[in-house]
Interface confidence: medium
């Protein structure tokens, strides 16, 4: 079997000019493509995987919301020579991420890292964004976690940050196939310059408290407190699977209009974000959709 | 059909500057990454530059690195290639191509540009 | 001096099979980047012969066919017509020089 192999990180590492073709294993009879993207309120970036697979084929596409960051996530296998092409790679160019313009800041400013590299997104060196609070959410908390996609034995991860909805989430995660998105929250501008080390204490969690001794004249306190020395139960999370919708593209001959963008175009939004998504701007599922070629 | 129509070439002196403009029709312009290739009389061709969809990445050749910019206006379907400090070498046929399925699939009719004293 | 070496001349007879080599290197067909042909007939534009090493566009006549192996590829014109008669370029892309890389391009000449 022969693949197509790439690997994308918020680049333009898939795009066809730089596609290879890989002879696979013997008894390797799938090829995948993964795609992993992510959708801040200030902008998104994807990552991207193809190769010799493994498993049965067919299609997994899912969209997850983990405190207002949300990810879409495709998952395509097949089983004929250089099927693992499929999937869109062309981007909804953010416009600068939605329009941001529309809302008002309301006061915390968060380290951002959207499509950055490891190195560029270290302590507080990334750009500062304002937050904002859209579609009836408020977005007060900052984030900092990881993206990581694992696809044809190849695992690509590239770091997160960004305003959300959460001031106080600690090592919260949402998976897909062959995909996490995970970190911490915290409260307080430009607090997410490294959370790596956030431990479950947050400031919403009531500290333990070493009661006096009752006096003996004094009636039963009618006011109780909760002690605990097991991690305190998080208020429930927000996160919530999505339906994501699919941009599939059968593998045509040149006339098919091909091009793509920096990132996935996976058409359609989630609740949440549909305010900035420019969704009138962009062709709906099936409509022109242009897998790039960057070259040659 | 794919149809590409670049203007703007002509006769400069070393040093000065042009603007080249490449109109699209026949397809979803604002969905396709661009390129500009050139083909200097009698010689290959050479890959200039390319940009985006969106027109948010671009990318360029060493060699005009620094003094040629490629832009688009999605809203007017056109392509542009500005073109400062110009050089001897630079004459050249310009072509405007679109990107597509792993290749360039569609191709203007090119713009010659003479760099000259 | 391309990227890509080609032969710079090339002939044939009505009907018979040419052949068109397209050398590169371990950073560019090597690393196993997808090879493309362009035609270029006289006094006009390129056009998109063979994509993704032997992909052929609609349109495009199944007397010419594209091969890929190692460090090299191919194009091979069957049947020969005197409309074959054209400029004709490889092109990859380049690990080393990040960028597409063309051929310097073969002249084919029918007799």
């Known amino acids: 079997l022969e693949c197509y192999s790439c690997v994308q990180k918020a680049d333009d590492g898939c795009s066809p000019n730089k596609m290879k073709t890989v002879k696979c294993a013997p008894g390797v009879d799938v090829c995948t493509e993964a795609v992993g993207a992510v959708e801040t309120i200030h902008g998104q970036f994807s990552l991207a995987v193809r190769g010799c697979g493994s498993g049965l084929p067919g299609k997994n596409d899912r969209g997850l919301d983990l405190h207002g960051l949300l990810a879409f996530i495709q998952l395509q296998q097949c089983a004929q020579d250089r099927c693992n092409a499929k999937l869109n790679l062309t981007s909804r160019a953010l416009d600068p991420a939605g329009n941001e313009s529309a809302y008002p800041p309301n006061g915390v400013e968060c380290y951002s890292c959207v499509g950055l590299s490891r190195e560029a997104c270290q302590g507080t060196s990334p750009p500062v964004v304002s937050c904002y609070n859209a579609s009836d959410h408020v977005y007060k908390g900052c984030f900092d976690g990881n993206v990581t996609l694992t696809a044809a034995n190849v695992t690509v991860s590239l770091p997160v940050r960004g305003c959300v909805q959460d001031e106080f989430c600690t090592r919260d995660g949402v998976t897909g196939p062959g995909f996490t998105l995970s970190g911490s929250c915290c409260q307080g501008s430009r607090c997410n310059s490294d959370l790596r080390n956030k431990t479950y204490f947050s400031p919403r969690i009531p500290p333990l408290v070493r009661l006096p001794p009752p006096e003996p004249t004094t009636v039963a306190s009618t006011t109780s407190v909760t002690t605990s020395t097991s991690a305190p139960v998080r208020p429930t999370s927000t996160t919530k699977p999505m339906p994501a919708p699919t941009s599939q593209t059968p593998r045509q001959g040149v006339e098919h209009e091909a091009s793509r963008d920096e990132e996935p175009r996976l058409t359609g939004g989630a609740a949440g974000h549909q305010d900035r998504s420019n969704s009138g701007q962009y062709p709906a599922k099936g409509g022109p959709q242009q897998p790039h070629n960057k070259g040659c | 059909e794919v149809q590409l129509l670049e203007s703007g070439g002509g006769l400069v002196q070393p040093g000065g500057s042009l603007r080249l403009s490449c109109a699209a029709s026949g397809f979803t312009f604002s969905s396709a990454w661009m390129s500009w290739v050139r083909q200097a009389p009698g010689k290959g061709l050479e890959w200039v530059s390319y940009i985006s969809s969106s027109g948010s990445s671009t990318y360029y050749a060493d060699s005009v690195k620094g003094r040629f910019t490629i832009s688009r206006d999605n809203s007017k379907n056109t392509l542009y290639l500005q073109m400062n400090s110009l050089r001897a070498e630079d004459t050249a046929v310009y072509y405007c191509?679109?990107?597509?399925?792993?290749?360039?699939?569609?191709w203007g009719q090119g713009t010659l540009v003479t760099v000259s004293s | 001096q391309s990227v890509l070496t080609q032969p710079p001349s090339a002939s044939g007879t009505p009907g018979q099979r040419v052949t068109i080599s397209c050398s590169g290197s371990s950073s560019n067909i090597g690393a196993g980047y997808v090879v493309h042909w362009y035609q270029q007939l006289p006094g006009t534009a390129p056009k998109l012969l063979i994509y993704?090493?032997?992909q052929r566009p609609s349109g495009v006549p199944d007397r010419f066919s594209g091969s890929k192996s190692g460090t090299s590829a191919s194009l091979a014109i069957s049947g020969l017509r005197s409309e074959d008669e054209a400029d004709y370029y490889c092109?990859?892309?380049?690990?080393?020089?990040?960028?597409?890389?063309f051929g310097g391009g073969t002249k084919l000449t029918v007799l």
């Open positions: 191509a679109r990107e597509g399925l792993w290749a360039f699939d569609g």
């Open positions: 092109a990859a892309y380049d690990d080393s020089l990040n960028r597409p890389v």
């Open positions: 993704d090493n032997n």
